[in-house]
Interface confidence: medium
């Protein structure tokens, strides 16, 4: 069956300077290919965080993602500014062999509202 | 305080349409999901559609798609449910449901209305 | 879709008797996990959410646990305004939302 990724939470709200986590879970690794996280859609969605390996400021992983049979790809993203406020997406992608990666599925999104402290 | 008045239902026969709304109150209407949750004679819940408060976001439950369509009107903070060929199965009380605005569970229900599709 | 069933159907008791209702998910849904309370000719009541949670102004007689596919809902000595049918409802999943079939909690 068709991977599935989920995102619980509709909406999270985090004040200014505060650390937030975002929960995505997926039914299956497969097909072989990276979860990444994006902020927006469309021509303005911005790269968030990859579990691939690179290092993003402010943001790491909840759980042990090289643990065998890991499914949480959950993110925490911490010291949060008004400028990280927006929807958030969870994105699952099939490799490619030369070509770019495909994306296949991603969550239903989670928006970050950002309060003054 | 919150409130939901559904209205609209009635005897209708297998095939025809109602149009069912909800009028909300004692809340900002267009910063929440709203659903329609419907509940046959005797049995339990069965969740039918959801709309975002944009009203971008629109799901239905396989036993309604192509026949239900929900809308909304955030100018006059009601909701709407355009119920097409309509079926003996159908036959429920029909609630509108207000979402927490951080999870898809529900914190207030109307009183329901009653739609009974016979011939 | 995830499937959500709930035991015993009917559950006869007394007041005062403790109540200890079951729902069980198809697959986790973590602790994503409400509970309502129907009486006749009414709508539904939010009871519990987040598995644990209790909705506002809801007794503390009732109580919620468990996480992933076990659920229960427990009230700790019944009164006469508990006596209803209580369904669970998952919201882990996008939709479609779904609920349990019920417990119908009647006197002894």
């Known amino acids: 069956t068709e991977v599935k990724v989920t995102q619980p939470e509709k909406s999270v709200s985090v004040a200014a300077g505060d650390s937030t986590i975002l929960n995505c879970t997926v039914t299956s690794l497969l097909p072989v290919g990276p979860i990444r996280w994006y902020r927006g859609v469309g021509q303005s969605r911005l790269l968030i965080y990859s579990f691939t390996g690179e290092h993003f400021p402010r943001i790491r992983n909840v759980s042990d993602t090289t643990k065998r049979n890991n499914m949480d790809f959950s993110i925490r993203i911490s010291n949060v500014t008004p400028e990280d406020a927006g929807t958030y997406y969870c994105v699952k992608f099939q490799r490619g062999s030369s070509e770019p990666d495909t994306e296949i599925q991603s969550g239903g999104g989670t928006e970050v509202y950002v309060l003054a402290k | 305080e919150v409130q939901l008045v559904e209205s609209g239902g009635g005897v209708v026969q297998p095939g025809r349409s109602l149009r069912l709304s909800c009028a909300a109150s004692?809340?900002?209407?267009?910063?929440?999901?709203v659903n329609w949750v419907r509940q046959a004679p005797g049995k339990g819940l069965e969740w039918v559609s959801l709309?975002?408060?944009?009203?971008?976001?629109?799901y239905y439950a396989d036993s309604v798609k192509g026949r239900f369509t929900i809308s909304r009107d955030n100018s006059k903070n009601t909701l709407y449910l355009q119920m097409n060929s309509l079926r003996a199965e159908d036959t429920a009380v029909y609630y509108c449901?207000?979402?927490?605005?951080?999870?898809?569970?529900?914190?207030?229900w109307g009183q329901g209305t009653l739609v009974t599709v016979s011939s | 879709e995830i499937v959500l069933t709930q035991s015993p159907g009917t559950l006869t008791l007394s007041p005062g008797e403790r109540a200890t209702l079951s729902c069980r998910a198809s697959?986790?849904?973590?602790?994503?996990l409400a509970w309502y309370q129907q009486k006749p000719g009414q709508a539904p009541r939010l009871l519990i959410y987040g598995a644990s949670s209790r909705a506002t102004g809801i007794p503390d007689r009732f109580s919620g646990s468990g996480s992933g596919t076990e659920f229960t809902l427990t009230i700790s000595s019944l009164q006469s305004e508990d006596f209803a049918v209580y369904y669970c409802?998952?919201?882990?999943?996008?939709?479609?939302?779904?609920f349990g079939g019920g417990t119908k909690v009647e006197i002894k």
């Open positions: 709309i975002s408060g944009s009203g971008e976001i629109i």
């Open positions: 409802q998952q919201y882990y999943d996008r939709p479609p939302l779904t």
């Open positions: 697959q986790s849904v973590y602790t994503y």
């Open positions: 004692g809340f900002t209407f267009s910063s929440y999901d």
């Open positions: 449901a207000k979402e927490n605005n951080r999870y898809r569970f529900f914190d207030d």
